[in-house]
Interface confidence: medium
């Protein structure tokens, strides 16, 4: 069966300077390939976090994704700023051998509202 990516929150509100968690789980780790978080859609979408080892300031994974069979790819964004407002998507990719990774499934998106402190 096809992997399913779930983002249960439709929206979260967070005060500027605080941190927030964006929840995402998958039903399967197959096919092999990374999970990435983006803000926005289409040409304007911005890579926010990738579960592939790179360092992303202010953002970290919530659960230990190195553990076998971990299906939780939630992230915590700390010190939120107004520029962080937008819709965040958790996206599953299939790893390509020579070609680029292929996007196979996206969560429904979580809108982040940033409130003035």
């Amino acid at each position: 069966t096809e992997v399913k990516v779930t983002q249960p929150e439709k929206s979260v509100s967070v005060a500027a300077g605080d941190s927030t968690i964006l929840n995402c789980t998958v039903t399967s780790l197959l096919p092999v390939g990374p999970i990435r978080w983006y803000r926005g859609v289409g040409q304007s979408r911005l890579l926010i976090y990738s579960f592939t080892g790179e360092h992303f300031p202010r953002i970290r994974n919530v659960s230990d994704t190195t553990k076998r069979n971990n299906m939780d790819f939630s992230i915590r964004i700390s010190n939120v700023t107004p520029e962080d407002a937008g819709t965040y998507y958790c996206v599953k990719f299939q790893r390509g051998s020579s070609e680029p990774d292929t996007e196979i499934q996206s969560g429904g998106g979580t809108e982040v509202y940033v409130l003035a402190k």
Epitope: K4, P8, V12, T25, G108
Partner: antibody
Framework: EVQLVESGGGVVQPGRSLRLSCAAS????????VNWVRQAPGKGLEWVSL????????YYADSVKGRFTISRDNSKNTLYLQMNSLRAEDTAVYYC????????????WGQGTLVTVSS | ETVLTQSPGTLSLSPGERATLSCRAS??????LAWYQQKPGQAPRLLIY???SRATGIPDRFSGSGSGTEFTLTISSLQSEDFAVYYC??????????FGGGTKVEIK
């Protein structure tokens, strides 16, 4: 106070059409996703369809896909359900339900309107 | 699609007794579960969300617990107005949103 008032129900023959309306008041209608949920006589609740606040995102239950169309007019604070090719198994009370703004559970419901499909 | 199974189908109890209703999910829904009460001829009313948080205006004799696939709604001391049908609903999975089949709490 949130109010959801359904109308448009009635008796209709199989294969015919009907349009339900749900008039909303007491909240910023365009900011909320709204749903239709139905209940056949003596049975449980069955989710039918959902439409996002902007109208851009729509989902249907498999049982009504291709026959029912959900829509909304935010200028009139009204939700609609166009029901075509009606079947006996569509007989139910149809409720309009407002979702919570963060999650997909229902914090406000209308009183319901009865649709009876019978020849 | 996540299937919710409620048990028992009917619970016959007397006023003042404790009612324990069960809802089991076919796959984990974490704590994304709501409970509703429905009286004859009325629309459902939200009781519990997030598996254990009471909705506004709901008396504290109603409590919810559980996570993952096993959930419980408890009414600590049944009042006459509590005799009704109770439904659980998961909102973790993407639509279709699903309800349990309901548990009727009736007067013994």
């Amino acid at each position: 106070e949130v109010q959801l008032v359904e109308s448009g129900g009635g008796v209709v023959q199989p294969g015919r059409s009907l349009r339900l309306s749900c008039a909303a008041s007491g909240f910023t209608f365009s900011s909320y996703d709204v749903n239709w949920v139905r209940q056949a006589p003596g049975k449980g609740l069955e989710w039918v369809s959902l439409i996002s606040g902007s109208g851009e995102i729509i989902y249907y239950a498999d049982s009504v896909k291709g026959r029912f169309t959900i829509s909304r007019d935010n200028s009139k604070n009204t939700l609609y359900l166009q029901m075509n090719s009606l079947r006996a198994e569509d007989t139910a009370v149809y409720y309009c339900a407002k979702e919570n703004n963060r999650y997909r559970f229902f914090d406000d419901w209308g009183q319901g309107t009865l649709v009876t499909v019978s020849s | 699609e996540t299937v919710l199974t409620q048990s028992p189908g009917t619970l016959s109890l007397s006023p003042g007794e404790r009612a324990t209703l069960s809802c089991r999910a076919s796959q984990s829904v974490y704590t994304y579960l709501a409970w509703y009460q429905q009286k004859p001829g009325q629309a459902p009313r939200l009781l519990i969300y997030g598996a254990s948080s009471r909705a506004t205006g709901i008396p504290d004799r109603f409590s919810g617990s559980g996570s993952g696939t096993e959930f419980t709604l408890t009414i600590s001391s049944l009042q006459s107005e509590d005799f009704a049908v109770y439904y659980c609903q998961q909102y973790y999975d993407r639509p279709p949103l699903t309800f349990g089949g309901g548990t009727k709490v009736e007067i013994k």
